[in-house]
């Protein structure tokens, strides 16, 4: 017989709770872990069950993105018995068990943190052996990356009527401030954030036209730090050369 | 493209077998609970068997236990139904079906496959 | 083993109606219901999971809530595309077990 809980509450401490007369489950996660790009973060997750000294198989999941459903990140799986909890995945091979699932933790350590890890997490434990249980945090921890401004992708593009563009793309968290100097702009230019489309980290400003030859630069600043890069654009017979 | 896709279904007289195969592609397959639903002409859906990431543990139905044999062979993302003992009411649609979850249960089937027709007859 | 019940075992609307079909389990199950539409000669698709998860790329219309015995699976306004068959399954504990069906047929 396969019996399963599953949590049904939750407070402003993402304490997770299912409770019923001599059993309950539940899971403590914070809400949100914050940590810096290329550092380690932990998410903590303890939990309590209704099977009192449990022995048997175990396995902790890490997912990401949403519960249930979204992809593993982290999974390992102890024996009968064991504390060891042997890793079955950890992807990119930057994820750790901090905690001993034995003993009701099911904490994470997550190493050399970029933008794209910026996502909620979720754990979850199941028992199977004599018992068979799985619960899982519905609501998870939001990981929060900063990260100082880099600049991804500057460059001169040809425009209608022989004319020329600069394109400029930074990431960072906070989203970064882009500006622009160069000749005929003045000491700089700033121009309007435009975060694109599913890259929530990233943010383009273009110079629309280039009236002059000479270096153009792009300066990227949050409240991390600042970062900057050039295009010099020199037109021979209608072309244009460009470097960084 | 993620799929599952069954073979192995066919015409066979009580007592006889039949083995089912569910070839699985793009997802990692060894990371999921897969499962065997049936569906008996102009009838509902029937939970058949369950296996669990690794084959450590299986699960049956008490109309086919001791009869199927659930197994995996996660080196070739495959998954089978050995069938023994047919009955007539064993007549059906065998679909394979990936678990939404994990490993080891099925929080729900979230991926299946078209699905493979056993007539059991004389 | 838990007993899966559904109703109506069929309905009849039309499009731009607003469906409820429940499913009533013979004990608790907690929030581990899905429900799955099944057209003929096709496989079932997942819907809603975990009772009240709507399964990527299935339409904002359809939407699931319930926990315990009594679930409720919900369309908004139903479309030509909606008359099908649906199932609601527990994976509470096994042997999982389906509901008998709901036949959504056009008035």
């Known amino acids: 017989f396969v019996r399963t809980k599953i949590d049904t509450t939750e407070n402003l401490l993402n304490t997770e709770v299912h409770s019923s007369p001599a059993q309950r489950w539940s899971m403590q996660v914070p809400p949100e872990v914050s940590a810096e790009a290329g550092d380690a973060a932990v998410l903590p997750c303890t939990f309590t069950h209704p099977h009192r000294h449990y022995d048997g198989p175990l396995t902790a999941i890490w997912r990401a993105g949403e519960p249930y459903a979204g992809p593993q990140v982290f999974r390992c799986a102890a024996a009968r018995g064991s504390e060891l909890c042997q890793t079955a995945l950890s992807l990119h091979g930057r994820f750790r068990l901090l905690g001993n699932p034995r003993r009701n933790d099911l904490s994470l350590r997550v190493e050399r943190l970029a933008l794209a890890d910026d996502r909620r997490y979720f754990c979850r434990v199941e028992f199977a052996g004599d018992v068979h249980d799985r619960y899982e945090s519905r609501h998870g921890v939001r990981l929060h990356v900063t990260a100082a401004p880099r600049i991804v992708n500057i460059s001169v593009l040809p425009s209608p009527a022989h004319a020329f563009r600069a394109l400029c793309t930074a990431e960072g968290e906070p989203p970064p401030a882009l500006a622009w100097s160069g000749p005929a702009l003045g000491n700089s230019l700033a121009a309007v954030r435009s975060p694109r489309e599913g890259h929530g980290h990233l943010v383009t400003a273009e110079l629309p036209a280039l009236t002059h030859d000479g270096r153009y630069t792009c300066t990227a600043a949050n409240s991390l730090g600042r970062s900057e890069a050039s295009v010099y654009l020199f037109r021979f017979h209608g072309a244009s050369g460009a470097s960084t | 493209e993620v799929q599952l896709l069954e073979s192995g279904g066919g015409l066979v007289q009580p007592g006889g077998s039949l083995r089912l195969s569910c070839a699985a592609s793009g997802f990692t397959f060894s990371s999921y609970a897969m499962s065997w639903v049936r569906q008996a002409p102009g009838k509902g859906l029937e939970w058949v068997s369950t296996i669990t990431g690794g084959g450590e543990s299986t699960y049956y139905a008490d109309s086919v236990k001791g009869r199927f044999t659930i197994s995996r062979d996660n080196s070739k993302n495959t998954l089978y139904l050995q069938m023994n003992s047919l009955r007539a009411e064993d007549t059906a649609v065998y679909y394979c079906?990936?678990?939404?979850?994990?490993?080891?249960?099925?929080?729900?089937?979230?991926?299946w496959g078209q699905g493979t027709m056993v007539t059991v007859s004389s | 083993d838990i007993q899966m019940t559904q109703s109506p075992s069929s309905v009849s609307a039309s499009v731009g109606d607003r469906v409820t079909i429940t499913c009533r389990a013979s004990?608790?199950?907690?929030?581990?219901l899905a429900w799955y539409q099944q057209k003929p000669g096709k496989a079932p698709k997942l819907l809603i999971y975990?009772?009240?998860s709507l399964q990527s790329g299935v339409p904002s219309r359809f939407s699931g809530s319930g926990s315990g015995t009594d679930f409720t699976l919900t369309i908004s306004s139903l479309q030509p595309e909606d008359f099908a068959t649906y199932y609601c399954?527990?994976?509470?504990?096994?042997?999982?077990?389906f509901g008998q069906g709901t036949k959504l047929e056009i008035k």
């Open positions: 399954q527990q994976s509470y504990s096994i042997p999982y077990t």
């Open positions: 975990v009772a009240s």
């Open positions: 079906a990936k678990a939404i979850g994990s490993s080891w249960y099925s929080d729900a089937f979230d991926l």
């Open positions: 004990q608790d199950i907690s929030s581990w």
